[in-house]
Protein backbone atom coordinates (compact mmCIF):
# COMPACT_ATOMS: atom_id res chain seq x y z
CA UNK A 1 0.00 0.00 0.00
CA UNK A 2 2.48 2.11 0.77
CA UNK A 3 4.60 1.62 -2.33
CA UNK A 4 1.73 1.75 -4.36
CA UNK A 5 0.89 5.10 -3.18
CA UNK A 6 4.49 6.39 -3.44
CA UNK A 7 4.62 5.46 -6.96
CA UNK A 8 0.83 7.19 -7.64
CA UNK A 9 2.81 9.96 -6.68
CA UNK A 10 6.18 9.76 -8.18
CA UNK A 11 3.68 9.03 -12.10
CA UNK A 12 1.71 12.84 -10.85
CA UNK A 13 4.93 14.49 -10.11
CA UNK A 14 6.14 13.16 -13.57
CA UNK A 15 3.36 14.30 -15.44
CA UNK A 16 3.63 17.73 -13.92
CA UNK A 17 7.04 17.84 -14.67
CA UNK A 18 6.36 16.07 -18.11
CA UNK A 19 4.91 19.65 -19.59
CA UNK A 20 8.52 21.57 -18.92
CA UNK A 21 10.67 18.69 -20.06
CA UNK A 22 9.68 16.11 -22.60
CA UNK A 23 11.64 13.03 -21.58
CA UNK A 24 13.70 12.74 -17.86
CA UNK A 25 16.51 10.90 -17.00
CA UNK A 26 16.52 9.70 -13.41
CA UNK A 27 18.45 7.75 -10.74
CA UNK A 28 17.67 5.91 -7.68
CA UNK A 29 19.54 7.37 -4.85
CA UNK A 30 19.30 7.70 -0.99
CA UNK A 31 19.57 4.72 1.41
CA UNK A 32 16.93 2.45 0.71
CA UNK A 33 16.99 3.31 -3.03
CA UNK A 34 13.82 5.38 -2.76
CA UNK A 35 14.16 8.34 -3.84
CA UNK A 36 14.85 9.10 -7.51
CA UNK A 37 16.75 12.30 -8.83
CA UNK A 38 15.87 13.18 -12.56
CA UNK A 39 17.64 15.23 -14.81
CA UNK A 40 15.82 16.68 -18.40
CA UNK A 41 17.16 14.34 -20.76
CA UNK A 42 20.12 15.06 -22.52
CA UNK A 43 21.70 16.85 -19.40
CA UNK A 44 24.38 15.48 -17.73
CA UNK A 45 24.09 15.13 -13.61
CA UNK A 46 26.63 15.70 -11.21
CA UNK A 47 26.05 15.63 -7.91
CA UNK A 48 22.54 17.86 -6.91
CA UNK A 49 22.77 19.76 -10.44
CA UNK A 50 22.12 19.18 -14.03
CA UNK A 51 24.20 20.76 -16.84
CA UNK A 52 23.86 21.50 -19.93
CA UNK A 53 26.26 22.67 -22.73
CA UNK A 54 24.60 24.88 -25.39
CA UNK A 55 26.52 25.37 -28.61
CA UNK A 56 24.23 28.53 -30.20
CA UNK A 57 25.99 31.06 -30.44
CA UNK A 58 24.95 34.18 -28.31
CA UNK A 59 25.30 36.81 -25.99
CA UNK A 60 25.72 37.09 -22.56
CA UNK A 61 22.47 37.79 -21.45
CA UNK A 62 20.72 36.36 -24.14
CA UNK A 63 22.13 33.11 -23.00
CA UNK A 64 21.17 33.85 -19.51
CA UNK A 65 17.94 34.35 -20.96
CA UNK A 66 18.04 30.81 -22.68
CA UNK A 67 19.11 28.92 -19.57
CA UNK A 68 15.95 30.85 -17.45
CA UNK A 69 13.04 29.70 -19.98
CA UNK A 70 14.66 26.12 -19.66
CA UNK A 71 13.94 26.49 -15.68
CA UNK A 72 18.09 26.95 -15.12
CA UNK A 73 20.64 29.76 -15.01
CA UNK A 74 24.08 30.04 -16.63
CA UNK A 75 26.69 27.80 -14.61
CA UNK A 76 27.99 28.95 -11.15
CA UNK A 77 30.40 26.96 -10.43
CA UNK A 78 31.33 25.92 -6.96
CA UNK A 79 34.40 24.12 -6.47
CA UNK A 80 37.27 22.17 -8.44
CA UNK A 81 35.62 19.26 -8.88
CA UNK A 82 32.56 20.75 -9.95
CA UNK A 83 34.43 22.38 -12.93
CA UNK A 84 36.36 19.12 -13.78
CA UNK A 85 32.83 17.33 -14.25
CA UNK A 86 32.22 20.09 -16.86
CA UNK A 87 34.99 20.60 -18.49
CA UNK A 88 35.03 16.90 -19.31
CA UNK A 89 32.10 17.46 -22.07
CA UNK A 90 33.24 20.82 -23.13
CA UNK A 91 35.53 20.95 -26.45
CA UNK A 92 39.03 22.69 -26.36
CA UNK A 93 38.56 25.52 -28.77
CA UNK A 94 35.42 26.81 -27.73
CA UNK A 95 34.93 29.18 -25.10
CA UNK A 96 31.42 28.93 -23.03
CA UNK A 97 29.88 31.74 -20.80
CA UNK A 98 29.46 31.07 -16.98
CA UNK A 99 27.45 32.83 -14.80
CA UNK A 100 29.83 35.24 -13.61
CA UNK A 101 29.27 38.79 -14.42
CA UNK A 102 30.51 42.37 -13.74
CA UNK A 103 28.22 44.73 -15.05
CA UNK A 104 29.06 47.82 -13.70
CA UNK A 105 32.91 47.22 -15.09
CA UNK A 106 33.99 47.72 -11.45
CA UNK A 107 35.58 44.07 -11.22
CA UNK A 108 32.33 43.27 -8.64
CA UNK A 109 32.05 39.82 -9.67
CA UNK A 110 28.71 38.61 -9.10
CA UNK A 111 27.25 35.30 -9.88
CA UNK A 112 23.78 34.95 -11.64
CA UNK A 113 22.28 33.10 -8.56
CA UNK A 114 23.47 35.50 -6.02
CA UNK A 115 25.95 33.09 -4.48
CA UNK A 116 28.27 35.31 -3.34
CA UNK A 117 31.55 35.50 -5.19
CA UNK A 118 34.54 34.16 -3.25
CA UNK A 119 38.30 34.75 -4.59
CA UNK A 120 39.24 31.80 -3.18
CA UNK A 121 37.20 30.06 -4.91
CA UNK A 122 37.83 31.23 -8.56
CA UNK A 123 40.05 29.64 -11.76
CA UNK A 124 40.47 32.66 -13.61
CA UNK A 125 43.70 32.08 -16.36
CA UNK A 126 46.70 33.82 -15.41
CA UNK A 127 46.62 37.75 -15.37
CA UNK A 128 42.59 37.29 -15.79
CA UNK A 129 40.43 39.30 -15.58
CA UNK A 130 42.58 42.15 -16.86
CA UNK A 131 40.25 44.66 -18.81
CA UNK A 132 37.03 46.65 -17.21
CA UNK A 133 35.18 46.44 -20.69
CA UNK A 134 35.21 42.51 -20.40
CA UNK A 135 32.31 42.78 -17.93
CA UNK A 136 31.60 38.17 -18.48
CA UNK A 137 32.83 35.63 -17.84
CA UNK A 138 33.35 32.31 -19.84
CA UNK A 139 35.60 28.82 -19.20
CA UNK A 140 38.13 28.06 -22.01
CA UNK A 141 41.01 26.19 -22.54
CA UNK A 142 44.30 27.77 -22.42
CA UNK A 143 47.86 27.06 -21.80
CA UNK A 144 47.55 23.46 -20.77
CA UNK A 145 44.48 23.94 -18.71
CA UNK A 146 40.91 24.72 -18.53
CA UNK A 147 40.03 28.54 -16.75
CA UNK A 148 38.04 31.71 -16.62
CA UNK A 149 38.46 34.45 -18.75
CA UNK A 150 36.74 38.07 -18.86
CA UNK A 151 35.38 38.75 -22.31
CA UNK A 152 32.83 41.09 -24.00
CA UNK A 153 29.08 40.35 -23.00
CA UNK A 154 27.75 41.41 -26.35
CA UNK A 155 30.16 39.16 -28.13
CA UNK A 156 28.60 35.58 -28.59
CA UNK A 157 29.76 32.70 -27.36
CA UNK A 158 28.58 28.87 -26.29
CA UNK A 159 27.36 28.47 -22.96
CA UNK A 160 26.81 26.23 -20.55
CA UNK A 161 23.44 25.96 -18.23
CA UNK A 162 22.97 24.44 -14.71
CA UNK A 163 19.36 23.17 -12.25
CA UNK A 164 18.99 21.85 -9.12
CA UNK A 165 18.66 18.07 -9.60
CA UNK A 166 14.52 17.19 -9.97
CA UNK A 167 13.82 14.70 -6.96
CA UNK A 168 10.44 12.77 -7.39
CA UNK B 1 38.83 67.30 -25.77
CA UNK B 2 38.11 64.20 -27.61
CA UNK B 3 39.35 64.27 -30.73
CA UNK B 4 38.38 61.80 -33.81
CA UNK B 5 40.42 62.99 -37.10
CA UNK B 6 39.74 60.29 -40.21
CA UNK B 7 41.84 60.40 -43.59
CA UNK B 8 42.38 57.99 -46.16
CA UNK B 9 39.36 58.42 -48.27
CA UNK B 10 39.35 59.28 -51.75
CA UNK B 11 37.77 57.80 -54.87
CA UNK B 12 38.77 54.22 -55.97
CA UNK B 13 38.00 51.76 -58.70
CA UNK B 14 36.21 48.50 -58.16
CA UNK B 15 38.17 45.88 -56.80
CA UNK B 16 40.88 48.47 -55.59
CA UNK B 17 41.95 49.29 -52.13
CA UNK B 18 41.90 51.71 -49.31
CA UNK B 19 43.66 52.39 -45.80
CA UNK B 20 41.53 54.50 -44.16
CA UNK B 21 43.17 56.19 -40.78
CA UNK B 22 41.98 57.70 -37.22
CA UNK B 23 43.99 60.35 -35.06
CA UNK B 24 43.07 60.37 -31.15
CA UNK B 25 43.67 62.59 -29.31
CA UNK B 26 42.58 64.21 -25.87
CA UNK B 27 41.72 60.56 -24.14
CA UNK B 28 43.61 57.68 -23.56
CA UNK B 29 43.34 55.86 -26.73
CA UNK B 30 44.19 52.74 -25.10
CA UNK B 31 41.45 52.46 -22.87
CA UNK B 32 39.09 52.04 -25.50
CA UNK B 33 37.05 50.17 -28.34
CA UNK B 34 36.78 51.55 -31.03
CA UNK B 35 34.65 51.04 -34.23
CA UNK B 36 34.07 52.26 -37.67
CA UNK B 37 30.48 52.96 -38.88
CA UNK B 38 29.75 54.13 -42.50
CA UNK B 39 26.89 56.19 -44.25
CA UNK B 40 25.92 55.64 -47.80
CA UNK B 41 24.78 58.89 -49.62
CA UNK B 42 21.72 59.61 -48.14
CA UNK B 43 21.05 56.74 -46.10
CA UNK B 44 21.43 55.53 -42.45
CA UNK B 45 24.45 54.42 -40.44
CA UNK B 46 25.66 51.11 -40.47
CA UNK B 47 28.38 49.44 -38.64
CA UNK B 48 31.70 48.47 -40.32
CA UNK B 49 33.74 46.84 -37.54
CA UNK B 50 34.86 46.84 -34.09
CA UNK B 51 38.45 46.06 -32.21
CA UNK B 52 38.65 46.10 -28.40
CA UNK B 53 41.00 48.48 -26.33
CA UNK B 54 43.58 45.72 -25.97
CA UNK B 55 43.48 44.42 -29.50
CA UNK B 56 42.05 41.02 -28.42
CA UNK B 57 38.84 41.19 -30.48
CA UNK B 58 37.66 42.27 -34.02
CA UNK B 59 34.05 41.80 -35.46
CA UNK B 60 32.43 42.24 -38.71
CA UNK B 61 28.82 42.32 -40.13
CA UNK B 62 29.45 39.82 -43.13
CA UNK B 63 29.24 42.39 -45.95
CA UNK B 64 32.59 43.48 -45.43
CA UNK B 65 33.97 40.34 -43.90
CA UNK B 66 37.13 39.09 -45.46
CA UNK B 67 37.84 42.37 -47.29
CA UNK B 68 37.75 44.73 -44.35
CA UNK B 69 40.74 44.40 -41.77
CA UNK B 70 40.45 47.06 -38.46
CA UNK B 71 43.96 47.35 -36.24
CA UNK B 72 45.46 49.88 -33.94
CA UNK B 73 48.22 51.26 -32.77
CA UNK B 74 47.69 52.09 -29.19
CA UNK B 75 51.42 53.39 -29.02
CA UNK B 76 50.43 56.27 -32.18
CA UNK B 77 47.26 56.83 -30.80
CA UNK B 78 45.75 55.27 -33.79
CA UNK B 79 43.01 53.19 -35.36
CA UNK B 80 43.12 51.64 -39.04
CA UNK B 81 40.45 50.38 -41.43
CA UNK B 82 42.40 48.43 -44.14
CA UNK B 83 38.94 47.73 -46.98
CA UNK B 84 40.27 45.50 -50.04
CA UNK B 85 37.79 44.21 -52.47
CA UNK B 86 36.21 47.67 -52.82
CA UNK B 87 32.62 47.16 -54.50
CA UNK B 88 30.16 50.03 -55.04
CA UNK B 89 28.27 49.64 -52.39
CA UNK B 90 30.97 50.44 -49.87
CA UNK B 91 30.85 54.06 -51.30
CA UNK B 92 29.97 55.78 -48.03
CA UNK B 93 31.49 58.61 -45.64
CA UNK B 94 32.97 56.34 -42.89
CA UNK B 95 33.52 57.63 -39.14
CA UNK B 96 35.64 56.25 -36.33
CA UNK B 97 33.69 56.01 -33.14
CA UNK B 98 34.87 55.25 -29.46
CA UNK B 99 33.24 52.88 -27.45
CA UNK B 100 31.79 53.67 -24.13
CA UNK B 101 30.65 50.44 -22.13
CA UNK B 102 27.68 50.90 -20.20
CA UNK B 103 26.81 47.42 -18.42
CA UNK B 104 26.25 44.22 -20.62
CA UNK B 105 26.26 47.00 -23.73
CA UNK B 106 28.31 49.79 -25.34
CA UNK B 107 27.20 53.24 -27.32
CA UNK B 108 29.25 55.44 -29.42
CA UNK B 109 30.03 58.88 -27.43
CA UNK B 110 32.10 60.34 -29.43
CA UNK B 111 32.76 60.69 -33.50
CA UNK B 112 35.39 61.33 -36.14
CA UNK B 113 34.09 64.15 -38.37
CA UNK B 114 34.02 61.57 -41.31
CA UNK B 115 35.85 60.32 -44.72
CA UNK B 116 34.51 60.16 -48.19
CA UNK B 117 35.22 56.49 -49.97
CA UNK B 118 33.87 56.89 -53.55
CA UNK B 119 33.77 53.36 -55.28
CA UNK B 120 33.62 54.38 -59.26
CA UNK B 121 35.15 52.86 -62.60
CA UNK C 1 20.93 39.94 -36.11
CA UNK C 2 18.00 42.56 -33.90
CA UNK C 3 16.33 44.51 -36.20
CA UNK C 4 15.27 47.74 -35.47
CA UNK C 5 12.31 50.02 -36.67
CA UNK C 6 11.71 53.25 -36.39
CA UNK C 7 8.63 55.16 -37.39
CA UNK C 8 7.82 57.94 -38.42
CA UNK C 9 10.12 58.62 -41.07
CA UNK C 10 9.59 61.93 -41.05
CA UNK C 11 7.67 64.32 -39.44
CA UNK C 12 7.05 68.01 -39.12
CA UNK C 13 6.50 69.55 -36.17
CA UNK C 14 5.88 73.25 -35.17
CA UNK C 15 8.20 74.86 -32.70
CA UNK C 16 7.05 74.85 -29.12
CA UNK C 17 5.21 71.51 -29.75
CA UNK C 18 6.41 68.07 -28.88
CA UNK C 19 8.10 65.23 -31.17
CA UNK C 20 7.96 61.73 -30.73
CA UNK C 21 9.90 58.91 -32.44
CA UNK C 22 9.50 55.65 -31.92
CA UNK C 23 12.20 52.78 -32.36
CA UNK C 24 10.95 48.86 -32.11
CA UNK C 25 13.19 45.88 -31.93
CA UNK C 26 12.70 42.76 -33.16
CA UNK C 27 13.61 41.01 -29.60
CA UNK C 28 14.17 42.58 -25.84
CA UNK C 29 17.25 44.45 -25.79
CA UNK C 30 16.70 44.78 -21.78
CA UNK C 31 18.19 42.71 -19.04
CA UNK C 32 17.33 42.89 -15.43
CA UNK C 33 16.47 46.50 -15.63
CA UNK C 34 19.22 48.01 -17.94
CA UNK C 35 18.04 48.93 -21.76
CA UNK C 36 20.66 48.78 -23.70
CA UNK C 37 19.26 51.36 -26.34
CA UNK C 38 20.83 54.49 -27.34
CA UNK C 39 19.69 57.62 -29.56
CA UNK C 40 21.93 59.99 -31.77
CA UNK C 41 21.04 63.46 -33.62
CA UNK C 42 23.19 63.82 -37.05
CA UNK C 43 22.18 67.19 -38.32
CA UNK C 44 23.35 67.60 -41.85
CA UNK C 45 26.77 67.42 -43.32
CA UNK C 46 27.53 66.53 -39.35
CA UNK C 47 28.63 63.17 -37.60
CA UNK C 48 25.97 61.69 -35.59
CA UNK C 49 26.20 62.88 -31.99
CA UNK C 50 25.10 60.77 -28.73
CA UNK C 51 21.47 62.11 -27.12
CA UNK C 52 20.68 59.32 -24.76
CA UNK C 53 22.26 56.17 -23.88
CA UNK C 54 20.86 53.33 -21.89
CA UNK C 55 17.35 54.32 -22.90
CA UNK C 56 17.01 56.96 -20.61
CA UNK C 57 20.23 58.79 -19.89
CA UNK C 58 20.88 62.05 -21.22
CA UNK C 59 24.17 63.01 -22.28
CA UNK C 60 26.72 65.38 -21.04
CA UNK C 61 25.54 68.62 -22.87
CA UNK C 62 22.18 67.37 -24.71
CA UNK C 63 19.42 69.99 -23.57
CA UNK C 64 17.16 68.99 -21.08
CA UNK C 65 14.13 68.77 -23.70
CA UNK C 66 15.55 65.74 -24.90
CA UNK C 67 14.37 62.52 -22.92
CA UNK C 68 14.01 58.92 -23.20
CA UNK C 69 12.29 55.98 -22.48
CA UNK C 70 11.06 52.32 -23.26
CA UNK C 71 11.80 48.74 -21.81
CA UNK C 72 12.35 45.54 -23.72
CA UNK C 73 11.15 46.20 -27.52
CA UNK C 74 9.65 49.53 -27.40
CA UNK C 75 11.58 53.06 -26.98
CA UNK C 76 10.60 56.21 -27.46
CA UNK C 77 12.81 59.55 -27.92
CA UNK C 78 10.67 62.69 -27.53
CA UNK C 79 11.77 66.31 -27.89
CA UNK C 80 9.35 68.61 -26.05
CA UNK C 81 9.74 72.11 -26.72
CA UNK C 82 11.31 71.49 -30.39
CA UNK C 83 13.57 74.47 -31.33
CA UNK C 84 14.35 75.60 -34.94
CA UNK C 85 17.53 74.27 -34.31
CA UNK C 86 16.56 70.64 -33.58
CA UNK C 87 16.08 70.08 -37.49
CA UNK C 88 17.75 66.89 -38.13
CA UNK C 89 17.96 63.02 -38.49
CA UNK C 90 17.72 60.80 -35.27
CA UNK C 91 18.95 57.42 -34.77
CA UNK C 92 18.05 54.55 -32.39
CA UNK C 93 21.19 51.95 -31.87
CA UNK C 94 21.02 48.85 -29.70
CA UNK C 95 24.33 47.57 -27.64
CA UNK C 96 22.95 44.27 -26.32
CA UNK C 97 24.66 41.83 -28.60
CA UNK C 98 26.98 41.96 -31.63
CA UNK C 99 26.46 43.41 -34.67
CA UNK C 100 25.45 46.76 -32.67
CA UNK C 101 22.38 47.66 -35.18
CA UNK C 102 21.07 50.99 -35.91
CA UNK C 103 17.46 51.79 -36.51
CA UNK C 104 16.88 53.37 -40.50
CA UNK C 105 16.57 57.44 -38.97
CA UNK C 106 13.83 59.54 -38.54
CA UNK C 107 13.84 63.14 -39.94
CA UNK C 108 12.39 65.76 -38.22
CA UNK C 109 11.54 69.03 -39.82
CA UNK C 110 10.50 72.16 -38.05
CA UNK C 111 7.58 73.70 -39.75
Known amino acids: NFMYSKTVKRLSKLQEYQQYYPSLTCVMEGKDMEDWSCCPTPWTSFQSSCYFISTVMQSWTKSQNNCSVMGADLVVINTKEEQDFITQNLKINSAYFLGLSDPKGWRHWQWVDQTPYNKNVTFWHSGEPNSPDERCAIINFRSEEWGWNDVHCHVPQKSICKMKKIYI | EVQLVESGGGLVKPGGSLRLSCAAS????????MSWVRQAPGKGLEWVST????????YYPDSVKGRFTISRDNAKNSLYLQMNSLRAEDTAVYYCARQLYYSYGYYFDYWGQGTTVTVSS | DIVLTQSPASLAVSPGQRATITCRAS??????????MHWYQQKPGQPPKLLIYAASNLESGVPARFSGSGSGTDFTLTINPVEAEDTANYYCQQSIEDPPTFGGGTKVEIK
Open chain 3, 27 to 36: ESVSFHGTHL
Open chain 2, 51 to 58: ISSGDSYT
Open chain 2, 26 to 33: GFTFSSYG
